[in-house]
Interface confidence: medium
């Protein structure tokens, strides 16, 4: 496997087994300092493929509250404000990392978990299957 | 310090300082078993607010590769395939958790970090500011 040059100040770990257990500092560094806090907050209403946000809550997970987008329509909103079914509203999905306590209720032991979340919706041209 | 009721099978941690360091198992549990692997893969081209995917790579971060969406146009693609500047293509952003090696190059020591990523684009009606 790959050998990473080791910083002499690294914590020692004799456990070379996979699955790997690592030390993680929970003083979370937030890199989003210069972002507009409003961000995408009103796009869900102004989009031609608008969506509703549903709360997905799990107190044994971090982050415990994740907002899931559900497209409001099968079609997209046209210039007249009506739903055009010649186009499709589809969810944009992303795989994200979350932390889950493992074993349950242990304050100092976690497992990384991947979950798929719908972040918002976009309007796409449908794939039309022509029958010969 | 705070005493949290402890599962008897928990790893011990005497460090009651803040920031806290915990053990994290990197054998990732993937909850996305019944999802279509194609997912949003072709939406970036079929969307009325199409986007390009840029590879953001950082060997000191886990995951080391993150794909960032950049909207192709300021406007949106209309029914004729032209860019309509009366509408706006905007990125849908999401805050995600990543692990960053800390100190750098340490294979077993990380810090949690939050970063903001653009997942895809959606077409929105612009906010028009009328001058009195």
């Amino acid at each position: 496997g790959i050998t990473i040059p080791r910083n002499p100040g690294c914590p020692n770990s004799e456990d070379k087994n996979f699955p790997r257990t690592v030390m993680v500092n929970l003083n979370i560094h937030n890199r989003n300092t210069n972002t507009n806090p409003k961000r995408s907050s009103d796009y869900y209403n102004r989009s031609t493929s608008p969506w509703n946000l549903h709360r997905n809550e799990d107190p044994e997970r971090y982050p415990s509250v994740i907002w899931e987008a559900k497209c409001r329509h099968l079609g997209c909103i046209n210039a007249d404000g009506n739903v055009d079914y010649h186009m499709n509203s589809v969810p944009i999905q992303q795989e994200i990392l979350v932390l889950r306590r493992e074993p349950p209720h242990c304050p100092n032991s976690f497992r990384l978990e991947k979950i798929l979340v719908s972040v918002g919706c976009t309007c796409v041209t449908p794939i039309v299957h022509h029958v010969a | 310090g705070i005493t949290i009721p402890r599962n008897p099978g928990c790893p011990n941690s005497e460090d009651k300082n803040f920031p806290r360091t915990v053990m994290v198992n990197l054998n990732i549990h993937n909850r996305n078993t019944n999802t279509n692997p194609k997912r949003s893969s072709d939406y970036y081209n079929r969307s009325t607010s199409p986007w390009n995917l840029h590879r953001n790579e950082d060997p000191e971060r886990y995951p080391s590769v993150i794909w960032e969406a950049k909207c192709r146009h300021l406007g949106c693609i209309n029914a004729d395939g032209n860019v309509d500047y009366h509408m706006n293509s905007v990125p849908i952003q999401q805050e995600i958790l990543v692990l960053r090696r800390e100190p750098p190059h340490c294979p077993n020591s990380f810090r949690l970090e939050k970063i903001l990523v653009s997942v895809g684009c959606t077409c929105v009606t612009p906010i028009v500011h009328h001058v009195a």
Epitope: P63, S64, L99, R101 | F18, R20
Partner: nanobody, 119 residues
């Protein structure tokens, strides 16, 4: 969307009492441990007290034991901190925070309520 709103702070003389309240919205209040933390002028954040989801267990930093009482009303989505025998060193901005599984890590804070203990 998660919101925490504190109230009840003010100016009080040493030995006096105050009751802080925190109203929560945007999450299922009864599913989470809740915390009070404080920040004295020019100092870092200090954990003060926390209470389990059902109110069955409470924890306090040593300096407030016997003087502060944390409680909650899940039906009203509310958290409280009753403070008696207040001292000058209790002067701080008090925040309520939603407990996460990460020990002593809080994603969501209120705007805080200032408690000033002075004669």
């Amino acid at each position: 969307q998660v919101q925490l709103v504190e109230s009840g702070g003010g100016l009080v003389q040493p030995g006096g009492s105050l009751r802080l309240s925190c109203t929560a919205s945007g999450f299922t209040f009864s599913n989470y441990s809740m915390y009070w933390v404080r920040q004295a002028p020019g100092k870092g954040l200090e954990w003060v007290a926390n209470i389990k989801q059902d109110g069955s267990e409470e924890y306090y930093v040593d300096s407030v034991k016997g003087r502060f009482t944390i409680s909650r009303d899940n039906a009203r989505n509310s958290l409280y901190l009753q403070m008696i025998s207040l001292r000058a060193e209790d002067t701080a901005v008090y925040y309520c925070a939603k407990g996460e599984i990460l020990p002593l890590y809080f994603d969501h804070w209120g705007q805080g309520t200032l408690v000033t203990v002075s004669s």
